[in-house]
């Protein structure tokens, strides 16, 4: 916290101060609280409309949550000398709707970035890479938290939101060192197929609470370091053989699949067989069918092949109107 002013005192064993002013100017920006020992600056719930210019050079952890920043321009944190120690930056819930290219440039130690709970109508492809080069300098980011950044429908650009986020994640191959990526609660209908291939160091991937229907075109093969894959609360109906084989081939992974509307018909047979033998899925005994109606709430692990049938498709000549 900011230092208080002092006045001289004649009491024994007391610090005497030269004047009513602190001897050294306070380095904590207005509307912020600072801890030098924790190397932390908190400018929280202060309705700030821009990033303070006078951030102390010692800052390692910067909280700018609950503000009204609206736009994060290029070089929003660029200072001379640079904020060389800034390692964790939390901008969640600050009403950001636009993050421009190079917004996080000149932060050489930035390892963790949280942009959650901002309605990002525009996320520049170069927000994290800083340049439009085909291969840019590696970003120092290790953890990127982008939960609930989907804007309301009326603020969406013409292009798909999934595509906009994917473009920022793959630009310049800058995020090759990323270990943690959280993309929960973003109404994703699909995961663009090239994204994961550009993030080979991922250990933790959270895609929970989206609207993913299928993983058919998603490849996890490259993610040899993946330890946690969160797919809870999506719209997944079934995992097909290709996906099952890829997940089984990842040496350290734990997959979370709770609360998906699994369709327990003949297409589910391979997944049920796999679930019975795999150690990859956490809480697999909790997975239950949602469809068809006759199978609702049945536990997947308790199904056998006889339970998993598909209604025959009648040839057109036999169909009745």
């Amino acid at each position: 916290t900011s230092s208080a002013s002092s006045s001289s005192s004649s009491a024994p064993f007391l610090a005497s101060a030269a004047s009513a002013q602190p001897p050294l100017p306070d380095q904590c920006p207005a509307l912020c609280e600072c801890s030098e020992a924790a190397r932390t600056v908190k400018c929280v719930n202060r309705n700030l409309t821009e990033v303070p210019t006078d951030l102390p050079l010692y800052v390692r952890n910067l909280f700018l949550t609950g503000n009204q920043l609206a736009v994060l321009p290029a070089g929003a944190f660029a200072r001379r000398p640079p904020l060389a120690e800034l390692a964790a930056l939390n901008l969640s819930g600050s009403r950001l709707d636009e993050v421009r290219g190079g917004a996080f440039e000149h932060l050489p130690s930035l390892r963790q970035l949280d942009l959650s709970h901002n309605p990002l109508a525009y996320l520049s492809p170069f927000a994290f890479s800083g340049s439009n080069a085909s291969i840019s300098a590696p970003s120092p980011l290790v953890e990127l938290i982008l939960n609930h950044i989907v804007p309301p429908d009326d603020k969406r650009q013409n292009r798909s939101f999934e595509g906009m986020v994917a473009a920022a994640l793959v630009a310049g191959r800058a995020l090759q060192g990323l270990h943690l990526l959280e993309l929960a609660s973003n109404h994703f209908l699909y995961l663009p197929r090239d994204v994961l291939a550009q993030l080979p160091s991922l250990r933790y991937l959270d895609l929970s609470n989206n609207s993913l229907v299928s993983l058919t075109y998603v490849s996890f093969r490259n993610l040899t370091h993946l330890e946690s894959l969160h797919l809870e609360d999506n719209a997944l109906k079934v995992l097909h053989n290709g996906t099952l084989a890829e997940l089984q081939g990842l040496p350290h992974v734990r997959v979370f699949l709770d609360n998906n509307p699994w369709v327990c018909d003949c297409h589910m047979a391979d997944m049920v067989t796999w679930l019975k033998q795999t150690g990859v899925v956490q809480g697999k005994d909790r997975l239950t069918c949602a469809f068809p109606e006759k199978m609702r709430n049945r536990v997947l692990l308790e199904l056998n092949s006889a339970d998993l049938d598909c209604d025959p498709i009648l040839p057109p000549s036999l169909q009745t109107s």
Epitope: T1, S3, A4, S6, A15, A17, P22, P23, L24, Q27, C34, S35, E36, A37, A38, R39, P56, L57, Y58
Partner: antibody
Framework: EVQLRQSGPVLVKPGASLKMSCKAS????????MTWVTQSHGQSLDWIGL????????TYNQKFKGKATLSVDKSSNTAYMDLNSLTSEDSAVYYC????????????WGRGTSVTVSS | ENVLTQSPAIMSASPGEKVTMTCSAS?????MHWYQQKSSTSPKVWIY???KLASGVPGRFSGSGSGNSYSLTISSMEAEDVATYYC?????????FGGGTKLEIK
């Protein structure tokens, strides 16, 4: 009002140990590094060490390693320094001071604790 | 360790006289600080970041220097300036003080 209130003067016998205190007011001690400095009679100042009250991490002047031990009690907003195996050469005034990370300097100082080691 | 050598060790000046004292560092530093200590009191930060005056310090004081050589100047000596002045570096461990310059009045 920022103040650093140090414990009173002490007379101790050679070989003894002592613990002196530095109670902070006007600021939260956990937010600032605290440092200790010694001054023998009529001599210059000598930096003893630094403690980060937030993490408990300490950094010592090699010269005082094994002689001084720094600690803090965040709940009472107080910094402490233990001195052990005291000899007459340890007779001095010991100051606590608040360290300013952005300046690499001390801003507020206590009045000092006078230590006399004599048999 | 970075040894700071102050000179002169003792000096006296008449009221109104210009006073300059120096601090030489065995290794280059980017900033030097100066502390004033009056008899039987604790030191006070007087000049920080080489040339900036701490709050309440009279404008007749100034600081300058770079690298290995720094100085503190009083443009016009006054009686209240009688004290010992210490230079200090807090960049490299161990942090070190100069031996001090004791300023007296004629």
């Amino acid at each position: 009002e920022v103040q650093l209130r140090q414990s009173g003067p002490v007379l101790v016998k050679p070989g003894a140990s002592l613990k002196m205190s530095c109670k902070a007011s006007g600021f939260t001690i956990a937010d600032y590094y605290m440092t200790w400095v010694t001054q023998s009679h009529g001599q210059s100042l000598d930096w003893i060490g630094l403690i980060n009250p937030y993490s408990g991490e300490t950094t010592y002047n090699q010269k005082f390693k094994g002689k001084a031990t720094l600690s803090v009690d965040k709940s009472s907003n107080t910094a402490y320094m233990d001195l052990n195996s005291l000899t007459s050469e340890d007779s001095a005034v010991y100051y606590c001071a608040r360290w300013r990370l952005g300046y690499y300097a001390m801003d507020y100082w206590g009045r000092g604790t006078s230590v006399t080691v004599s048999s | 360790e970075n040894v700071l050598t102050q000179s002169p060790a003792i000096m006296s000046a008449s009221p109104g006289e210009k006073v300059t004292m120096t601090c030489s560092a065995s290794s280059s530093v980017s900033y030097m600080h100066w502390y004033q200590q009056k008899s039987s009191t604790s030191p006070k930060v007087w000049i920080y970041d080489t040339s900036k005056l701490a709050s309440g310090v009279p404008g007749r004081f100034s600081g300058s220097g770079s690298g290995n050589s720094y100085s503190l100047t009083i443009s016009s000596m006054e009686a209240e300036d009688v004290a010992t002045y210490y230079c200090f570096q807090g960049i490299g461990y161990p942090y070190t003080f100069g031996g001090g310059t004791k300023l007296e009045i004629k």
